[in-house]
Interface confidence: low
């Protein structure tokens, strides 16, 4: 598999001069760079930001640089009316208003165009009423809401913390229970962590700090007005009415100081355990309503932000591949901000910029890559995955038939502790090689490799001496390429200690604050951390891009498809008495699991020795790894999700971020219990196991001799 | 209070030379893309070129009519950004404006006028 | 290079009047449309910038609409001090280009 094989290159010209080429220093200013202004989804500074760019990548040596444009549906605070959330008396006066915007940071007083904090997608609307408090607004919360206290949020303002899942499913749950708004907050439980200060002088969450975000329930779908299709020039449009995903009911986002205000007065139900409690000095009671003095105040919404069809830019990079130039491996990151990015996402587009630059560098010195490389820096991911998506929806056809992988660039830091991967199990093998030749950039690692130090710090739960790698969930832009499409797809940044950092996400993630000296100060002053990160995603595009047999080891599949198999059984038996009622098997998933297992074993024993000399049979099997992954799409998609294809992995019903395995048949299971019609909800259990055991017996197929 | 106070404008021979200044106060000038638009008497606006910033490399574009002619420089030690205007024909005859990014703030202008 | 064309060139009205002065792009230009106000021997004022949102101390008689190719400045409830020359702008790409003004007289 060695790299300098693939397209006639001197020696120099390996992964080894690829990686040396990346430079800290030089992600350190792309940083600076991308940092100085806002660039949020279309607006002017982010257009010219895409074309400053397509000019760079340009002189960095790609062969073509384009700019994507769609035009897709946009959520913008409407600069007149300011949203904002009020406590008003018996008279309807406003005795408590929240803020209008966050304290700028220091050195920051001047710029203009900082979007306040809004929740994107929100209808307008002014609802007033009580408020009950609902913890995280989890599924399981709600249910302890009204199955265990028997309290009705039916015409109540939700407030929920932000944290554990994506708030687009917080919004989801509170509408199915009826509430007539949602307050999100940041509780400092979750976003300050104990012993650091807060911006300027640490990275905690001031109090006035407040996290931005999309509320959609998209479920893949890109666009909300252009379902399946690319908001292109002659797009036809859905109503907004009939548009995918979007919010019914106000919503807002606040920080803990206004929070503290709201929910300092609440009365009714105790909080039910100390879960529910976060670190203000609140009672955390749950209502409806205030308590005593306050009984006849109520909460106040006012909500004015539009929703606005509005054109957006994805840049496109091609480096021409010399061998198979029809084979693309794809780099991609987002461009666009809520505010200054200094995280989220230009950490990661900056490491981007340096990877095009380094691979620009080889082919400017006579170099190429086996295959085609595409980079990409999306656009308005901040408001769904537009975008990647939307791009994807317009070269479905050739990313089907060509599609080799597709690497994520996201932040590149969500801490400074170990290294964090999710991916296919096609990439295990991959990464587990590259990290061992990577040096580690950690304290008291010096002189070791990455893998040594990832695996000391984040363990496998299953495996001994080996890292953990996490299923891929959604919440980025490999959502279409993997969930949709079936391209084999991975991720990798540098996070914080899981163990002792409980907070969710990184405290100023997507608030006025992330800015680069948020990343320069406090997070990786030396830019190490994110020069690894450079050399894990580039290491794995020029693999990927360059290895004469693909770097993908499906017996890697077999193992956690048996894990998978093992995990919805048990959750399944915990319905004894039903499944024998109902005569629901697994059989079929157990027996295509262990096929899969025989067949992916026989076909790593011919891949050790077949003539690799051959082209066309090269071809062959280098084409039965790469379509292994597209062979867990199922056409017509999971129920009610039609753009979650992928029959093993899918993003998780109650959270958009995590990862589910066989998530068909998870959510057939889920809550089974407490269905109207058990016959129906068992029928459609086994009409899962069904899909399932079809779908991992017809990929194992695809990896048999094909004559 | 943003200000760009532009300077330098004057009678100038055709295939002169005449370098404008543009000083700025009240922002971070460091930080923003500065612009030169120019008005020729009783017409239109018309944009002459721009400058980014250090961290855009000092990257400079220009319209068509003055490409190779006109340089855009800038000094952000004093806030200053300059309009170097050489081989000056008599159509350059305008009210030269500079004005920040996105032509959100713009300066007094000063007259330059190419005249034999 | 996308030429701007607007239209009227020139208008007549009364105070309290409103007016609606139109510009038209050779191109697609998205929303990147600004529009600005000129009163004689003084500089452009920035009015309304991204086709609709009005810039900071800007009246709200004064609207902005449209994306593409067709844009629309409205004056609501016309002022003495808004009779002046106004000027569309797009800076969507290289080289930014105005239209040719629309002047707002007294009736």
């Known amino acids: 598999k060695s790299s300098n094989e693939a397209t006639n290159i001197t020696p120099k010209h390996n992964m080894k001069a690829f990686l040396d080429e990346l430079k800290a220093e030089n992600i350190k200013k792309f940083l600076y760079n991308f940092t100085q202004i806002p660039h949020l989804a279309g607006t002017e500074q982010n257009f010219q930001l895409a074309k400053q760019i397509q000019s760079q990548w340009k002189e960095f040596g790609l062969d073509s640089v384009e700019l994507a444009h769609y035009d897709v549906l946009l959520s913008y605070p409407n600069k007149t009316h300011p949203n904002y959330i009020s406590i008003i008396n018996e008279d309807g006066n406003e005795i408590f208003n929240t803020s209008l915007f966050e304290p700028p940071p220091p050195g920051y007083e001047n710029v203009s165009d900082i979007v306040p904090p809004f929740s994107a997608f929100s209808p307008q609307g002014m609802p007033e009423g009580d408020l009950v408090y609902v913890n995280y607004a989890r599924t399981e919360d709600f249910f302890k809401l009204e199955r265990d206290m028997k309290i009705n949020c039916s015409g109540k303002i939700v407030i929920a913390r932000y944290g554990k899942v994506f708030r687009g499913n917080k919004v989801k749950n509170a509408q199915l229970a009826g509430a007539k708004g949602v307050i999100l907050y940041s509780d400092p439980a979750d976003y300050f962590a104990p012993g650091v200060k807060s911006y300027p002088d640490g990275w905690n969450l001031p109090g006035g700090g407040v996290q931005r975000g999309n509320i959609l329930n998209l479920n893949g779908a890109g666009d909300p007005l252009t379902p399946g299709y690319p908001a292109n020039e002659y797009a036809y449009r859905r109503g907004i009415a009939e548009a995918v995903g979007l919010p019914s009911i106000p919503v807002h986002p606040i920080g803990y100081y206004d929070a503290q205000k709201l929910l300092e007065k609440m009365g009714g139900s105790a909080p039910p355990d100390s879960s529910w409690r976060g670190s203000l000095k609140v009672p955390y009671n749950v209502g409806p309503g205030f308590t005593g003095n306050f009984s006849t105040q109520k909460v106040k919404m006012h909500i004015h932000s539009t929703n606005e069809v509005t054109r957006i830019y994805n840049v496109i990079g091609t480096l021409r591949g010399a061998v198979e130039p029809d084979r693309y491996v794809i780099l991609g990151g987002h461009r666009d901000s809520w505010v200054f990015g200094g995280i989220d996402p230009q950490s990661g587009a900056a490491v981007v910029h340096e990877i095009v630059r380094s691979f620009g560098t080889l082919k400017k010195e006579g170099w190429r890559p086996r295959r085609t490389i595409l980079f990409a820096s999306w656009d308005a991911e901040e408001f769904g995955l537009l975008g990647s998506t939307e791009w994807a929806e317009e070269n479905s056809r050739l990313l089907q038939e060509r599609g080799v992988a597709y690497i994520n660039a996201d932040s590149s830091i969500e801490g400074n502790y170990t290294l964090r991967v999710d991916c296919t199990p096609l990439m295990y093998s991959l990464v587990h090689n590259l990290t061992k030749e990577l040096k580690s950039p950690d304290e008291g690692f010096e002189g070791k490799s990455l893998y040594e130090s990832w695996t000391k710090k984040s363990p496998s739960p299953e495996f001994s001496g080996m890292p953990r790698i996490s299923k891929l969930g959604s919440g980025n832009d490999f959502e279409v390429f993997f969930q949709r499409l079936g391209i084999a797809s991975g991720r990798a940044r540098y996070t914080k200690n899981w163990e002792t950092n409980k907070f969710s996400g990184y405290p100023l993630y997507h608030s006025v604050y992330e800015t680069y000296e948020l990343v320069e100060k406090f997070y990786d002053p030396m830019f190490k951390y994110h020069l690894t990160v450079a050399q894990v995603r580039g290491g794995m595009v020029f693999e990927l891009a360059n290895s004469i047999v693909l770097p993908f080891d499906c017996r890697d599949y077999a193992v956690v498809l048996r894990k998978y198999a093992d995990k919805i059984y048990s959750i399944s038996m915990k319905h004894p008495q039903e499944m024998k009622t109902y005569s629901v098997s697994f059989d079929s998933l157990f027996s295509a699991v262990k096929n899969f297992t025989e067949i992916a074993s026989k076909f790593s024993e011919r891949l050790q020795d077949f003539d690799k000399s051959n082209p066309i049979v090269l071809r062959m099997m280098n084409d039965q790894l790469m379509f292994l992954e597209r062979a867990f799409i199922d056409p017509l998609g999971l129920p009610d999700r039609p753009f979650y294809r992928h029959v093993i992995y899918a993003p998780s019903s109650h959270n958009k971020y995590a990862g589910e395995s066989f998530p068909g048949i998870y959510d057939a299971l889920f809550d089974i219990e407490s269905k109207v019609d058990p016959s129906k909800a068992w029928g459609e259990v086994k009409r899962q196991i069904y899909v399932a055991a079809f779908t991992v017996q017809a990929a194992a197929e695809t990896l048999s001799e094909v004559a | 209070e943003v200000q760009l106070v532009e300077s330098g404008g004057g009678l100038v021979q055709p295939g002169g030379s005449l370098k404008l200044s543009c000083a700025a106060s009240?922002?971070?000038?460091?930080?923003?893309?500065m612009n030169w638009v120019r008005q020729a008497s009783g017409k239109g606006l018309e944009w002459v070129g721009e400058?980014?910033?250090?961290?855009?490399?000092?990257?400079?574009h220009y319209a068509e009519s003055v490409k190779g002619r006109f340089t855009i420089s800038r000094d952000d030690s004093k806030n200053t950004a300059y309009l170097q205007m050489n081989s000056l024909k008599t159509e350059d005859t305008a009210v030269y404006y500079c004005?920040?990014?996105?032509?959100?703030?713009w300066g007094q202008g000063t007259t330059v006028t190419v005249s034999s | 290079d996308i030429q701007m064309t607007q239209s009227p060139s020139s208008v007549s009205a009364s105070v309290g009047d409103r007016v609606t002065i139109t510009c038209k792009a050779s191109?697609?230009?998205?929303?990147?449309v600004s529009w600005y106000q000129q009163k004689p021997g003084t500089a452009p004022k920035l009015l309304i910038y991204?086709?609709?949102n009005r810039f900071t101390g800007v009246p709200s008689r004064f609207s902005g609409s449209g994306s593409a190719t067709d844009f629309t400045l409205t004056i609501n409830n016309l002022q003495p001090e808004d009779f002046a020359t106004y000027y569309c702008?797009?800076?969507?790409?290289?080289?930014?280009?105005f239209g040719q003004g629309t002047k707002v007289e007294i009736k």
């Open positions: 191109e697609n230009v998205g929303t990147y």
């Open positions: 009240g922002f971070t000038f460091s930080n923003y893309w």
């Open positions: 400058i980014r910033s250090q961290s855009n490399n000092f990257a400079t």
């Open positions: 004005t920040r990014r996105w032509n959100n703030f």
């Open positions: 702008g797009q800076s969507y790409t290289f080289p930014y280009t």
């Open positions: 991204g086709a609709s």
